[in-house]
Every structure is written in C-alpha cells, then in structure tokens.
Interface confidence: low
C-alpha cells in the first residue's frame, strides 16, 4: 500500500465545531488483495518540526481515511500550542498519517507509508459562506500533485470536495470535472467526486499527466468557473530488461598509438526503459563483470559503467529512460612491443529486474593491440641564424605518428660529430612526444668554422629501449651583430613596439624580439606584448623549452602576480589580458594596461 500524495493541506479555524469533516487521505494498492487501514501519529507538530502537543483534537476513520475534528480547537488550546512553537507565530501545524500495518516509527515520515497533513491555522472563526471566493470554495490553497506507481491495480486517489465548506455551506453547489486528452486513464465520478485510475498505468508509455481540474460554483444565480492544474506523476519500477540499441552487442577496437592508462578503447551502449534503481543505488544493483579471460587481459583492461538519464519518445510525449555506457578502458600503459588480439566479454546484470525474461546481457569487445615501430625520416635539414639567442626554438623532430602517441615515452638525444660546434640541444615535449630543437650554446654558433652542424638524432622508447636514428644537418646563416647596450634579458620587459624590436632576448631565433599587436577587444587572448618569437610565445602554454628559464616567456610561464585586467592561465601565465601586457621576470610580476594611444606619435617626435 502507498499514499497517492506525500502531503495534504486544509484550513483550521478557532472554535470549529466537533464533528466537522476535514479531508480524506487516499491509499493505493500494490496488490489486489490489500486493504488499507489508516492511523494518525500521536502528536501535532509546528514550525521546524517542533513537537507541540499530543493530538487531542483530530481523529481519522481507519477504513475510509476521513480526518475530522474530535473536539473544538478553542482559544485556550490554540494559545497552549502557540507557546510551544519556539516563539514563532503559529501559522501551520501538521499531523502524520500512517498506513497500517507499517514498521515506521512516529519519528519517521517517509512516502510511501506515511503522509503529512498540514493545517493552515486561522485565529478567527470560519468565515461567512457568502464571503468565500470561488477559488476558496473549490480547491485548497496548495495545489495537489499525485504519485501513482506503474503496473499497480487501479484505485481512487483523490476526492475533490472541500469537506469543511460542504459541511458549513450546504447551500452552495460545487461541481467538478477533469479536462483530459482523449483516452486518458482517469475518471472523476460525478456523484462522489472521487478521482480514480481506470487501469494500471505504464510509465514507459507516459510519465506525467498534466490534467486540469474544473470547478463550477453555483451560488444563487451566480455561476463561476475555477480551473487548476492537476498533475499526476507515474512512478517507475524495474519492469524493463536492458537491451542493445539497434541490436549492437559487439564493439571492435584497435589499440595502436593511444596506449596510456585510462584510455577508453571502446564503448558499448545499453538501453533500459526504466529509471530505477535511482542513481545512488545504480552502480551497486546494475552490475558489470569482465568475464575471466587470460590473466594478461584481466590486468590490462577494466570496464567502467557510465549511466545517464535520457529521454525517449512514447506516444508523442517524452519519458525518461537510462542509457548505460560500458567503456573498455586500459588499466595500464601498454608497451610498444605488445601485439595481441582477443575477445573480451562483459556480463551486465540488472539485478532488480523481475522478468519476464532475463535482465542479463553479454557485451563483446573485439580488441587488437598492434605493436608500434619507431621511425624517423632519414635526414632533417634546418637553418639557424648566427644571431639566435640561447633557448631559441629552431625546429622539431618527431618519430612517425608521434603526435598521436599517448602512454609512449620517447626520449630524444643529439650526438654531435664536431665537439666544438655542439650548439643545439633537444628536449622532449610531453604534449605530442616530439623533440624540440633549441639553441643551447651561442658561443659555438658564432665560431666561423661552425657554419654547418652535423648531428645524429636518436629517439629511444624508454620502456623497451627500442631506437630510431636520423641525420640532422643544420646550416648557420647570417653574421653576428652585437646587441645594443641596455637591452633586457627578457623580451617581455618591453612595453612599446619600438624598444621591443630594437632588442633581442632569451629565446629569440633572429636575435631580435617580435611585437605582437593585440586586437584591442577588452580582456582578450590576443593582447599586445613583446615576444622572442610569436610562433611560440605567448600561446597560452608554457612549453618544455620555456620552462628552462623564466625570462624566455613569462607571459606563458610566470607563477607570480599579474596586475591589471587579465584572466590567469591554467596553471600559470596570462590566459587573456587587457591592452598591453609586459613582465619583469626577476620580480615575478606582469602588468596588463590599456594601450598608450599617444605612443607612436610620441616615438616619432622623440626621434
């Protein structure tokens, strides 16, 4: 048995006569043979669930669910209750109604076995019938909403009449009807004004019924109509077995370049028309088991269950349903030498499903793990300016498909053929497994005999020690020009275009800093700034070369404070700035300030 509502509302007036009917509560059956019996909790409660007093005023008919006044609530009783309400004015009191037999204790009141009946308390006598507005004659102040379990026997779940009004104003005629779409499963009996379901409901067909209750009031020659929403929600039970959308029970996957732990290799989707069990219980009661295969597979893969509520069409309306995504995930990094093909099976069990049929599905994942070979092109040819500054990025080396790699740790090394001309260094980028070539020794770069540099690039997989090699030929171009005196170590210090382009700085491939002109659109990623190379700085990312020295690109790498209009980078640097941003790396500070519009004019005049 269960209540069709979790809360009921009625009005109580001082000195209302004993024997006044107040309202009906209704229970619906879970099984045809059940017979409801109602009992009231012992106490009246007030504001913030304060226990006010033993209930000596209101009784219930155990078989019908009719609540009525057993004795009049007079002024002295009302004052007694008010005193106990923690000093708050006594506006609302409530009672708990239980379905018998029930295991619920007085302290607990949870739907479906308990409902609360709230009484709005008026410290006046019942108003004259002629003064009541049609809305007050027809419906309670708080609009009711109903909950009906699917697949349960039909039954009565509401009674329209406001019983105190009917009892005290017998000369006012009130009629009710339900406005409903064609063929909906509800009926309002014209004599008793009871609303009942005509047949058992199916939530998977329709979950919400937004009906409209129409009340017509006749008082003498006056006729008025009042309409209120009458919403019914159908509650779910686990009566649908899990299925495969479009019959897809097998997913095939190839593991090649993405070999990192936690990589999702393949996903299969299971559809369940139900939305139970609820999310807190779901993973415990909707189980997935990777069936035993070989030990390697058990160690290498795991299955992750990702349930999501969705909505599907049923008879022109949306109903909620659940899609369960089962992801086959790598449990560990896979070595590049691994080479296997296998079929994995996952057993999915909707343990609450009672049938007919089975609540069990078998998911199949066909997985091929391919080995990865390391290849480099036979030769790289690059050029570098003799004016390049230390940490200038001059190019990249990358094993075949390195940008697609994850979970593969490749380290690059340079072996120089001429010891005195070892100008370049290489660092491995964690982002795309490439090697970034940069100027490491500017003195060697300026030696006249170091016009052509020869290196061997060696790429090594750290896990298997497999290697690939390539020739690197670097041509040194141009002639060295000493920098003007007074130039800062970092390009980022310069705040104006002219001083920026006159100087070099750490990381500059040409020996000159570059000015990036912003778009001037408020706080923007494209702020104006001075950079060693606008190709790499700022780009919102502190790369592996820039981490070598804070002077290279503080716009991307600074962990200090940023003054002025900006959005900080994640985890460091300036993501977006206002106007022009310049930085003082030693002081660990950057400033973003509006563009100085007189700047070009001033520079021209000051020449």
């Amino acid at each position: 048995l269960y209540f069709s509502r979790d809360a009921y509302w009625e009005k109580l007036y001082v000195d209302q006569a004993a024997g006044t009917p107040l309202l009906y509560v209704h229970a619906l059956r879970d099984a045809p043979e059940e017979v409801p019996s109602f009992r009231l909790g012992q106490h009246l409660y007030g504001t913030y669930r304060t226990r006010l007093h033993e209930n000596n005023w209101i009784c219930i008919q155990e078989d019908t669910g009719l609540l009525y006044l057993n004795r009049s609530l007079d002024h002295s009783s009302w004052e007694k209750l008010s005193v106990r309400n923690r000093g708050f004015p006594l506006l609302t009191v409530y009672l708990k109604v239980f379905l018998s037999p029930t295991s619920l204790r007085e302290g607990e009141c949870q739907w479906p076995g308990c409902a609360r009946v709230y009484f709005s308390f008026f410290n006046t006598s019942f108003p004259a019938c002629s003064s009541l507005k049609p809305r007050e004659l027809c419906f309670p102040e708080t609009r009711p909403s109903f909950r009906i379990r699917e697949n349960r026997p039909p039954g009565t779940f509401h009674q329209f009449r406001l019983l105190p009004v009917q009892f005290l104003c017998p000369n006012i005629s009130v009629a009710y009807r339900l406005l409903e779409g064609e063929g909906l499963p509800f009926r309002c009996a014209p004599d008793s004004l009871e609303v009942s379901t005509r047949w058992a409901l199916d939530r998977e067909q329709r979950e919400k019924y937004e009906l409209v209750a129409v009340c017509t009031v006749h008082a003498g020659a006056r006729e008025e109509v009042v309409m209120v929403p009458f919403p019914v929600t159908v509650y779910d039970e686990d009566d649908s077995a899990p299925t495969f959308p479009a019959g897809v029970d097998t997913a095939s996957a190839v593991v090649e370049f993405k070999r990192k732990e936690d990589t999702v290799v393949a996903t299969l989707r299971v559809f369940d028309a139900d939305v139970v069990p609820a999310s807190g219980e779901l993973v415990r009661r909707y189980t997935s088991t990777l069936l035993p295969g070989d030990t390697w597979a058990q160690q290498t893969f795991r299955v992750e269950h990702w349930p999501n509520e969705t909505s599907v069409q049923a008879n022109g309306s949306f109903v909620r349903a659940t899609v369960h995504d089962y992801r086959l995930v790598l449990n560990r990094n896979l070595s590049i030498s691994e080479n296997r093909t296998m079929q994995l099976a996952v057993l999915v069990n909707d343990s609450d499903f009672q049938g007919p049929g089975a609540g069990v599905l078998l998911l199949h994942f066909n997985v091929s793990v391919l080995p990865v070979s390391l290849h480099l092109p036979s030769t790289y040819s690059l050029s570098v300016s003799r004016r390049a500054r230390r940490f200038a990025q001059i190019g990249k080396v990358c094993v075949e498909n390195c940008q697609a790699f994850s979970g593969i740790n490749v380290q690059y090394k340079l072996h120089s053929s001429g010891a005195n001309c070892s100008t370049l260094g290489v660092v491995t980028s964690a982002e795309d497994t490439s090697g970034i070539l940069f100027v490491n020794d500017t003195k060697a770069l300026r030696r006249p005999k170091c016009a052509e540099l020869h290196y061997m690039v060696v790429a090594t997989d750290q896990q298997t020690s497999r290697q690939a090699q390539a020739q690197l030929l670097v041509t040194v171009e141009g002639s060295y020009v000493a920098e003007e005196a007074g130039c800062p170590l970092s390009c980022a210090v310069s705040k104006r275009r002219l001083e920026c382009e006159e100087c070099g700085g750490l990381g500059s491939p040409t020996g000159r800093c570059e000015w990036r002109q912003g778009d001037g659109k408020g706080i923007t990623r494209n702020f104006s700034t001075c950079s060693p190379s606008t190709k790499t700085c700022p780009d919102g990312h502190c790369d592996v070369v820039e981490t070598q020295d804070i002077n290279i690109c503080p716009q991307d790498c600074l962990r200090g404070s940023i003054v002025g209009g900006h959005e900080p980078g994640e985890p460091r640097g300036i993501k977006a700035g206002y106007g022009t941003c310049n930085c003082f790396p030693e002081e660990e500070k950057c400033f973003c300030e509006p563009e100085d519009i007189q700047d070009p004019l001033c520079d021209e005049l000051c020449r």
């Epitope: 479009a246 069409q313 022109g316 309306s317």
Partner: antibody, heavy 120, light 107 residues
Framework: QVQLVESGGGVGQPGRSLRLSCVAS????????MHWVRQAPGKGLDWVAI????????YNVDSVKGRFTISRDNSKNTLYLQMNSLGAEDTAIYYC?????????????WGQGTLVTVSS | DIQMTQSPPSLSASVGDRVTITCRAS??????LNWYQQKPGKAPKILIY???RLQSGVPSRFSGSGSGTDFTLTISSLQPEDFATYYC?????????FGGGTKVEIK
Amino acid sequence: QVQLVESGGGVGQPGRSLRLSCVASGFTFRNYGMHWVRQAPGKGLDWVAIIGYDGSKEYNVDSVKGRFTISRDNSKNTLYLQMNSLGAEDTAIYYCARESPITGTTFDYWGQGTLVTVSS
Amino acid sequence: DIQMTQSPPSLSASVGDRVTITCRASQSIGNYLNWYQQKPGKAPKILIYAASRLQSGVPSRFSGSGSGTDFTLTISSLQPEDFATYYCQQSYSTPLTFGGGTKVEIK
C-alpha cells in the same frame, strides 16, 4: 485536420531579437513534442530546437545555444522561438514541425514556414 | 554529432525511370532514419520513417532500405509529381541532422 501556422518572421538587424510563433490546431497540442527546423535560402534543412510535450525537455543545436530559446504555451496551443543576438547566418525560412506519435523524432506535420532575414 | 552524407547531390531522370538515392551516416544509427520530399516554396513532407516504413498516404512506388550506416531511397517508377528535392534525416541522437539533399530534375 492538423495545421501549423508560423508567424513573426521579417527583417531583423544584426544583434537584435525576433520572436517566432507557431499556432497549432487539429490535434491535442499538449500531447506532442515540437521542433523548429530552418532552411537558409537555396540550402538544405537544419534542425534548430526541440521541446517536450510538457515544456520540460528543451534542446538547442550548438550554433544557437545561449541565443535562441524554445518555449510553448499549451493553453494557447502555441510554440515559440525567441531569437536573440541575431547574425547574418540566421537568415532562413523557419518551420515548426510536430513529432510523429509513432516514431518520435520524425516530423509528420510541418508549417508553411516564416522567413527571417537578418540585415543591417 | 552524426554527419549525414547524401549522394548524388542532383540527378536527371525521365518519367518512368527507377531512381535510387543513397544516404550514409558517420556512425551506426540502426534504423533511425527518415526520408522527406520538398518541392520549391513548400515545406518538407515525410515519406519514409524507421528506414523502410512507408508513411500513411505516400504512394507505394517509394521505398526505403538499409540499416547501420548505409541507406537507400528508391522510386520504382518516377512520376511527374516526384520531381523535387529529397532529404534524409537521422533520429538516433540529438542534435538531429539532415543530409545535404538530392535534387531530382527532369531530363
């Protein structure tokens, strides 16, 4: 018989707003999901937005998210599309369409369309 | 998002010809596919739903087939009133997407 009649189209300026309406008749409007679909001049069909039978489910395509709002008033049998921050790319004929009760997201009845032109 | 690719973009045919239009989805969509016909200046009209089911009132010369990613609309004997643009649409997941259309013109 089922009828869907759109209105509210016309010339809108970039950055401004328009509100389209679609009045339904000949069927129980509150029992059906409804959609807006648009068609740029000389181009194909593009789905814009969906709303559930009771207004509880809304979904807009990414290109209009945050700018367009679909809503309905079941008491007036009317579907709406509030279009804010209009751009030239929103120039199109806008159709309202009813979902099929049999197959869900199939459009079994369409309005005649209303033309929205965004131009300064 | 699921991309729908229709081919050919246009074709010329004569009355009585058998005409085939194909539609390919970028991922498997089961049978969640619909076909529409649109004539100039008019709203589209549903022909086929669920890949192969004929909408009530649509002539039987129209038929649909396919499942997964590849689908076909066939007009067994082209009639004068069939010269129009045809669109496929997936209803497997939101955002709902249409094919680019196939224009059937008189040869």
